[in-house]
Interface confidence: low
Amino acid sequence: SQVSQNCHNGSYEISVLMMGNSAFAEPLKNLEDAVNEGLEIVRGRLQNAGLNVTVNATFMYSDGLIHNSGDCRSSTCEGLDLLRKISNAQRMGCVLIGPSCTYSTFQMYLDTELSYPMISAGSFGLSCDYKETLTRLMSPARKLMYFLVNFWKTNDLPFKTYSWSTSYVYKNGTETEDCFWYLNALEASVSYFSHELGFKVVLRQDKEFQDILMDHNRKSNVIIMCGGPEFLYKLKGDRAVAEDIVIILVDLFNDQYFEDNVTAPDYMKNVLVLTLSPGNSLLNSSFSRNLSPTKRDFALAYLNGILLFGHMLKIFLENGENITTPKFAHAFRNLTFEGYDGPVTLDDWGDVDSTMVLLYTSVDTKKYKVLLTYDTHVNKTYPVDMSPTFTWKNSKLPNDITGRGPQGGGGSENLYFQ
């Protein structure tokens, strides 16, 4: 049956899917608060632009009886059930915000004719790449892969004079939703990461990981894992680690590293942490005071989804264009809009661009310091600390293969970013 969109005559509605299975275990009340805060901002912006229209959100809850595991692994059908609810009510907003789980987003995209835009806080997996009406407001796996390949190839920085072509990936199946899909992308045999690396092995057992740390016959010195410092400590403990081991800890949605009083524990000295550049004003926001750092990013993505809709609505209304058209559905990409915490850029495929930050532990201060940053929009690495106080020999990152001779480094007088 044809679902009518409540999206004309000065009244514009946002359908927000409130799913029991979510990328992050966030109370739905917090997401409602984020959406409502976003609505207030959008109304103000439209009013300032002289557009006298009504913007509201309809929250659509799943019944929670069938799909109540709380995590994403059982979410495939939940999104479709919610779409059926919309279909039964024959009422749909101008835009769909949610779902956040890769499985449900992928299934919803397959099973519906999406003539309206879908905005997701999550949907991290490669299966949600290149979807014409899907916008993702949290860094998807593709962006991580591009950073890693770029960083592996870099060989002309004062602290990284070797190209790397090998890696171990630790993935034991208990990861959070974001980590699950990030590691999945690295594991996939047909992914860009796998294509660019000469050697890659996935470690699935704790013991495998622990053995590699001191194994003289290891095939790579580099281990990628995903999670926070506590997760690493549970696995590694205070075990001895060979001096040329480098652990890359992917912990994108955690800005605790940037807090003033944080001291890096000793077990983090062989670790480079990949995280996102921290926001500025979120800590004081009414909806985020009680949120953990990860959940703050999740709630922010919901809020920014509302602001993105407001941005597009304003443009189309000012140009006198119809909102219920394929043009509107396909417009949520290749743009920059004013997010809650500053400008937000979406790439050609509607995926959020961001500044990734690689941190190291200073052996002098025991503080996390920024080694380099990476702008996903232009696929470039920018060095920040040209003389890092590393634990590694000569304050340089080691070669990825023990015993391999030096490879061509950078030029003598100039240091360049990649």
Epitope: V370, H377, Y382, G410, N414, Y416, F417, Q418
Partner: antibody, heavy 122, light 110 residues
Framework: EVQLVESGGGLVQPGGSLRLSCAAS????????MHWVRQAPGKGLEWIGE????????NVHEKFKDRFTISVDKAKNSAYLQMNSLRAEDTAVYYC???????????????WGQGTLVTVSS | DIQLTQSPSSLSASVGDRVTITCRAS??????????MQWYQQKPGKAPKLLIY???KLASGVPSRFSGSGSGTDFTLTISSLQPEDFATYYC????????FGQGTKLEIK
């Protein structure tokens, strides 16, 4: 002495092609980013794109992606700009430049070539 | 792209004058405590020459009468006491996201 020298400019008909060269000397070419910037008569500077000789990673501005290609020959310490489907509005002086990154982590265009004039006219 | 707007577009001044040119970016060009903004001088028929990098750092060989300031979106180039050789066109440039230049400010003799 650090130097960049462009060549290959001249008169070309609309729809035609031209390949500009930039010969680099006096510095380690392979680890730099080499750029092309143009300036139409009486107008401002417009960035076209860049290439990193060490791994031939290129970034070309959206405006030029379909028609312009940047390449390098590391053996010759040279960068190239291949321009196809030329239009009258491509008439400009084309400069080759490089970015350096200082030890403090800043980057900018510090050395420029003298420029080569491309005129697109029938 | 980040847009850069320079003002004024042209300016007449005399030798010895203090001159200020401003450049406004469409979004912040700050990056980890640095402002990725440069100023270049260009004379007719010549290539641009770097004057200031990172908003306020003087490039090698540039006279100290040139100075730069600003952060975020608003930047200024100041020439404290104009010399005859300073009459030229000045461009600001950002390297925060790709590379864009301002439209230029032509500094002429009054």
């Amino acid at each position: 002495e650090v130097q960049l020298v462009e060549s290959g400019g001249g008169l070309v008909q609309p729809g035609g092609s031209l390949r500009l060269s930039c010969a680099a000397s006096g510095f380690t070419f392979s680890s730099t980013w080499m750029h092309w910037v143009r300036q139409a008569p009486g107008k401002g500077l417009e960035w076209i794109g860049e290439i990193k000789p060490s791994n031939e990673l290129t970034n070309v501005h959206e405006k030029f992606k379909d028609r312009f290609t940047i390449s390098v020959d590391k053996a010759k310490n040279s960068a190239y700009l291949q321009m196809n489907s030329l239009r009258a509005e491509d008439t400009a002086v084309y400069y080759c430049t490089r970015t350096i990154t200082t030890t403090e982590g800043y980057w900018f265009f510090d050395v420029w070539g003298q420029g080569t004039l491309v005129t697109v006219s029938s | 792209d980040i847009q850069l707007t320079q003002s004024p577009s042209s300016l007449s001044a005399s030798v010895g004058d203090r001159v200020t040119i401003t450049c406004r970016a469409s979004e912040s060009v700050d990056y980890y405590g640095s402002s990725l903004m440069q100023w270049y001088q260009q004379k007719p028929g010549k290539a641009p020459k770097l004057l200031i990098y990172a908003a306020s750092k003087l490039a090698s060989g540039v006279p100290s009468r040139f100075s730069g300031s600003g952060s975020g979106t608003d930047f200024t180039l100041t020439i404290s006491s104009l010399q005859p050789e300073d009459f030229a066109t000045y461009y600001c440039q950002q390297t925060r996201k790709a590379y864009t230049f301002g439209q230029g400010t032509k500094l002429e003799i009054k």
